[in-house]
């Protein structure tokens, strides 16, 4: 798939960053927004946002600019320039209240259809466990072999660089095709099926992706959110996968927070599988030693291990990928629609 | 430490109203949906309603629809409900319950902290 | 109203039996089903959530399964302390309902 390119979308931060500095006036909020970085700090929902007057007033000569509501796109080029300018931006428009954080990525529905031939799967045993047949499927694209092979040798050895680690999967879940990457991933094992639990577990090489010693979960999230690209993911997962009532329903649908879910994936913030046996997903972190903020932790834990919007995403996109092996289906050769799930 | 103490039970004749009241502590109230259950003498535990954090939402079991009101005043960190028209049958044993910290505004992952319970009698 | 059917309502068991114990709802419940202890005169205490997540503190003697519209909750090898009444009560849809109980006696 080509890269989305900045007029794709419908205000790229890029696009209207280029046309603020055509305005002097504009150009001068933006540099000096920019420089008050140091001084607007990210809070914690606890705190509260100290921001100087001169601030303020830079924040408000913005708020009439293009740059208010421009977006990125989480396969774009320059993703990285494009959510830096985002979150500058963003102080204008919340001026650093943590609880207007909105996802910086435009919602773009991919609807072409993903060729697959089982046939070539019947090199496979039979009774294969799907996780096995879903790797196969990757293995026979090109691409998603290419990107895979690449993560799991950076991934791999004794001495792995975990920092190389998480770019390479970063890398495998932006660029391999959707569906792979979810069949990858979320592939149905039988419940009593712990080889092909441990396998999906072991999709992300946890050994090596993941810290050797759980940190403090907060102090993640701090981390995360000094890093314009892994604070975009967490605050598109937080809105995608936000569980909207009493019981927990998704606010958007589980498509989109199951996109949002994988693109942490390489990031500070990564999530795997907790055990071989069911498909429950957690941070790998840790909420003990966080004093009067306990309770916060573990609201904040709570959001990967206990969300009922995610858990109800994952199992319906297991439900699907079980599907595509049934009997069910007249062909060996099928195309699946590439944002197909169930709601 | 995180704890329910519910109130207000006591002995009224069929027609009449009780508040019943639930006072937490220990956790962030507001963050918190909460819920009431109850159980009649020797039977099993029903379901009576439950309320969102703000107070905004609020469901009721048929059985107690249109005569039980749920509220929260979280500036108190306390829990109401308002049982008019009671009937026989809503005599029980009433708590109020809190969902785990991990899920507490929603209700999917079971309640994990529970009052010890006050006692409705009506009967005439 | 989803129904929430429990069985068996009694068991007679021995200190170190394993007891099974099931609940099957009259519709799909996904995941969305816990599991309780309750002890005369006192409240109920969460033992399992989500079907089969046992409840931080709860000896893993414990366990759950199930999913749709079947679960199970098993007891390893069963202790004194856990004579008690057991609930399940689905969480999927409004109103929330409880199975009818089941009482584990000393055989």
């Known amino acids: 798939d080509p890269l989305p390119t900045e007029s794709r979308l419908m205000n790229s931060c890029l696009q209207a960053r280029r046309k603020c500095q055509a305005d002097p006036t504009c150009s001068a909020a933006y540099h000096h927004l920019d420089s008050c970085t140091s001084s607007i700090s990210t809070p914690l929902p606890s705190e509260e946002p100290s921001v100087p007057a001169d601030c303020l007033e830079a924040a408000q000569q913005l708020r009439n600019s293009s740059l208010i509501g421009c977006m990125c796109h989480r396969r774009m080029k320059n993703q990285v320039a494009c959510l830096d300018i985002y979150w500058t931006v963003h102080r204008a428009r919340s001026l650093g209240n943590y609880e207007l954080d909105v996802s910086p990525y435009e919602d773009t529905v991919t609807s072409k259809p993903w060729k697959m031939n089982l046939s070539k799967l019947n090199m496979l045993k039979p009774d294969s466990d799907l996780c096995l047949k879903f790797a196969m499927l990757c293995t026979l694209n090109d691409k998603c072999d290419r990107l895979r092979k690449a993560y799991g040798e950076a991934c791999s050895g004794p001495h792995c660089q975990r920092h190389v680690c998480l770019r390479q999967l970063l890398t495998f879940f932006e660029k391999a095709a959707e569906p792979h990457a979810q069949g990858l991933l979320l592939c149905p094992c039988a419940p009593n099926d712990r080889g092909c639990g441990e396998r999906r577990r072991n999709t992300i090489a946890p050994n090596c992706a993941l810290p050797p010693v759980a940190p403090n979960c907060l102090e993640l999230r701090r981390l995360c959110f000094s890093d314009p690209l892994c604070r975009s993911r967490l605050v598109d997962f937080q809105t995608h996968c936000h569980p909207m009532d009493i019981l927990g329903t998704c606010a958007t649908e589980q498509s989109r927070c199951l996109r949002a879910y994988l693109g942490l994936i390489g990031t500070a913030m990564t999530p795997n599988f907790v055990s071989n046996v069911n498909t429950s997903v957690a941070l790998s972190c840790t909420c003990r030693g966080s004093g009067n903020l306990q309770e916060e932790c573990e609201m904040l834990e709570g959001f990967f291990s206990h969300n009922p919007c995610l858990t109800e995403a994952i199992a319906a996109k297991m439900r699907f990928h079980s599907q595509l092996f049934s009997q069910d289906w007249p062909h060996p050769t099928f195309a699946v629609m590439a944002h197909q799930n169930e709601n | 430490e995180v704890q329910l103490v519910e109130s207000g039970g006591g002995l009224v004749q069929p027609g009449e109203s009780l508040r019943l009241s639930c006072a937490a502590s220990g956790f962030t109230f507001s963050n918190y949906a909460m819920s009431w259950v109850r159980q009649a003498p020797g039977k099993g535990l029903e379901w009576v309603s439950v309320i969102s954090g703000s107070g905004g939402s609020t469901y009721y079991a048929d059985s107690v629809k249109g005569r039980f009101t749920m509220s929260r005043d979280n500036s108190k960190n306390t829990l109401y409900l308002q049982m008019n028209s009671l009937r026989a049958e809503d005599t029980a044993v009433y708590y109020c319950?809190?969902?785990?910290?991990?899920?507490?505004?929603?209700?999917?992952?079971?309640?994990?902290?529970w009052g010890q319970g006050t006692t409705v009698t009506v009967s005439s | 109203a989803i129904r929430m059917t429990q069985s068996p309502s009694s068991v007679s068991a021995s200190v170190g039996d394993r007891v099974t114990i099931t609940c099957r709802a009259s519709?799909?419940?996904?995941?969305?089903l816990a599991w309780y202890q309750q002890k005369p005169g006192k409240a109920p205490k969460l033992l399992i959530y989500?079907?089969?997540s046992l409840q931080s503190g709860v000896p893993s003697r414990f366990s759950g399964s199930g999913s749709g519209t079947d679960f199970t909750l098993t007891i390893s090898s069963l202790q004194p302390e856990d004579f008690a009444t057991y609930y399940c009560?689905?969480?999927?849809?409004?109103?929330?309902?409880f199975g009818g109980g089941t009482k584990v006696e000393i055989k």
């Open positions: 989500a079907a089969s």
């Open positions: 519709q799909g419940i996904s995941s969305w």
């Open positions: 319950a809190k969902p785990p910290s991990r899920a507490a505004r929603y209700f999917n992952y079971g309640m994990d902290v």
């Open positions: 009560q689905q969480a999927n849809s409004f109103p929330f309902t």
